[in-house]
C-alpha cells in the first residue's frame, strides 16, 4: 500500500511492495519526485551546477564552502561536482580561535584587529598562520519529493524528459 512506503520509497505495482527510489550518483541530485509511495515516470538525476556538489543518494546539490569570502581562509582544494571545497590556513591578517567550540560552520578565521596580544598568527606582520583549517561536512539531505517542490537547487527544470 502506498501509505506504508517510506520517504525514499515508491510502490512497485508489479511486486506489490515498496521499493527504494533509485539513488543518484556523486555529483548529481534528484529531479522530479520519488518517495512516500509514488515515483514520477521521468524521475531522474541531474548534474550539480557550477559551485555546487553532492555525494549522491537523495542529497540535493549544496554550495561549496566559501573559504575566502566566508571563512577568511585559503583554498586548499577547490570543490567540484562531487566534492566540497577544502579550506586551508587563514588568510593573511586573520587568525583562528583554536579552543573555541565549533559551530555549524566549523572553524572561522577572525581579523587580527580583534586578536588578543601575542596571537601567533598576528604577531609582527599580518601574515597567515600555518594552522590547518578543519573541513566541515554538515549533511542536509532532502528527499526528492521535498526537492521537487522546494526547487532549492536552482536547476529550474521545466518538463525535462
Amino acid at each position: 500500500e502506498y501509505s506504508n512506503c517510506g520517504e525514499n520509497e515508491y510502490y512497485n505495482q508489479t511486486t506489490g511492495l515498496c521499493q527504494e527510489c533509485p539513488p543518484c550518483g556523486p555529483g548529481e541530485e534528484p529531479y522530479l519526485s520519488c518517495g512516500y509511495g509514488t515515483k514520477d515516470e521521468d524521475y531522474g538525476c541531474v548534474p550539480c551546477p557550477a559551485e555546487k556538489f553532492s555525494k549522491g543518494g537523495y542529497q540535493i546539490c549544496r554550495r561549496h564552502k566559501d573559504c575566502e569570502g566566508f571563512f577568511r581562509a585559503t583554498v586548499l582544494t577547490p570543490g567540484d561536482m562531487e566534492n566540497d571545497a577544502e579550506c586551508g590556513p587563514c588568510l593573511p591578517g586573520y587568525y583562528m580561535l583554536e579552543n573555541r567550540p565549533r559551530n555549524i560552520y566549523g572553524m572561522v578565521c577572525y581579523s587580527c584587529l580583534l586578536a588578543p596580544p601575542n596571537t601567533k598568527e598576528c604577531v609582527g606582520a599580518t601574515s597567515g598562520a600555518s594552522a590547518n583549517f578543519p573541513g566541515t561536512s554538515g549533511s542536509s539531505t532532502l528527499s526528492p519529493f521535498q526537492h521537487a517542490h522546494k526547487e532549492l537547487s536552482g536547476q529550474g527544470h521545466l518538463a525535462t524528459a
Epitope: 533509485p22 529531479y31 515516470e41 538525476c45 541531474v46 548534474p47 551546477p49 529550474g156 521545466l158 524528459a161
Partner: antibody, heavy 119, light 107 residues
Framework: EVPLEESGGGLVKPGGSRKLSCAAS????????MHWVRQAPEKGLEWVAY????????YYADTVKGRFTISRDNAKSTLFLQMTSLRSEDTAMYYC????????????WGAGTTVTVSS | DIQMTQSTSSLSASLGDRVTISCRAS??????LNWYQQRPDGTVKLLIY???RSQSGVPSRFSGSGSGTDYSLTISNLEQEDVATYFC?????????FGGGTKLEIK
C-alpha cells in the same frame, strides 16, 4: 543485434501522412523513455518528440505539434511516430533514440530512416 | 528555447593532434551538456554526458569540460576514426536543443 531499428521512411507528397516505427531489441523496452530526433539534409540534429516509459508523459517540438503523434507498444517493444500534414521542411533522416534510465540524454541511437516530402 | 552554438562549423587537424571543440548555451544549463559523434555513414553515438562523464566504451582520448554556458570537447590524440561531426546537446530543459555541429577532418 541492433538495439534500435527504424522503418517506414520513403517519399511522401506535401500534405500526406506517414507512420514510422522503431523496433527495440536486447533491452527491456518498457523501462525506457524514448525520443525521435531528426536531421534535415546537410543540417544539424533537431529533437522532435518524447514519450516516457509508460506513456504518461509526452512532449513535442513546436515545429511538429498538432501534426505528429508519438506512441509506443511496450508489449511489442516498438515506438511509433505518426506524421500528418507533411511539409517539405519535414524532409529528414529520422532517428529513434533511447533515454538513459535516470538521466536526461540519448544513450542509444538507431541508424535512422529517411523521409522525403516532395511533389 | 535554449540556443546552442558551436562557433566552428568545420576544422582540420593532423593525426596525433589535440583538438578542442567548443559549444556555448544561450543561458546557464547547469552542466547538463552532452556530446555526440556522428560518423560519415550517419551513425550517432554518445561520447560524453553531463559535461565531463565518459560514456562506457568511449576511448579515453575524449574528454569534456565546462560550466555555466561554456563547454568544450577535447580529443587528445587525434585518430583517423575520429573523422566525424560532433554535436553538443543540452538536456536541461525541453525542447532539447543541439549545436549546429563541428565537422572534423584530417589534414
Amino acid at each position: 543485434e541492433v538495439p534500435l531499428e527504424e522503418s517506414g521512411g520513403g517519399l511522401v507528397k506535401p500534405g500526406g501522412s506517414r507512420k514510422l516505427s522503431c523496433a527495440a531489441s536486447g533491452f527491456t523496452f518498457s523501462d525506457y523513455g524514448m525520443h525521435w530526433v531528426r536531421q534535415a539534409p546537410e543540417k544539424g540534429l533537431e529533437w522532435v518528440a518524447y514519450i516516457s516509459s509508460g506513456s504518461s508523459a509526452i512532449y513535442y517540438a513546436d515545429t511538429v505539434k498538432g501534426r505528429f503523434t508519438i506512441s509506443r507498444d511496450n508489449a511489442k517493444s516498438t515506438l511509433f511516430l505518426q506524421m500528418t500534414s507533411l511539409r517539405s521542411e519535414d524532409t529528414a533522416m529520422y532517428y529513434c533514440a533511447r533515454r538513459e534510465i535516470l538521466r536526461y540524454y540519448f544513450d542509444v541511437w538507431g541508424a535512422g530512416t529517411t523521409v522525403t516530402v516532395s511533389s | 528555447d535554449i540556443q546552442m552554438t558551436q562557433s566552428t562549423s568545420s576544422l582540420s587537424a593532423s593525426l596525433g593532434d589535440r583538438v578542442t571543440i567548443s559549444c556555448r548555451a544561450s543561458q546557464d544549463i547547469s552542466n547538463n551538456l552532452n556530446w555526440y559523434q556522428q560518423r560519415p555513414d550517419g551513425t550517432v553515438k554518445l561520447l560524453i554526458y553531463y559535461t565531463s562523464r565518459s560514456q562506457s566504451g568511449v576511448p579515453s582520448r575524449f574528454s569534456g569540460s565546462g560550466s555555466g554556458t561554456d563547454y568544450s570537447l577535447t580529443i587528445s590524440n587525434l585518430e583517423q576514426e575520429d573523422v566525424a561531426t560532433y554535436f553538443c546537446h543540452q538536456g536541461k530543459t525541453l525542447p532539447y536543443t543541439f549545436g549546429g555541429g563541428t565537422k572534423l577532418e584530417i589534414k
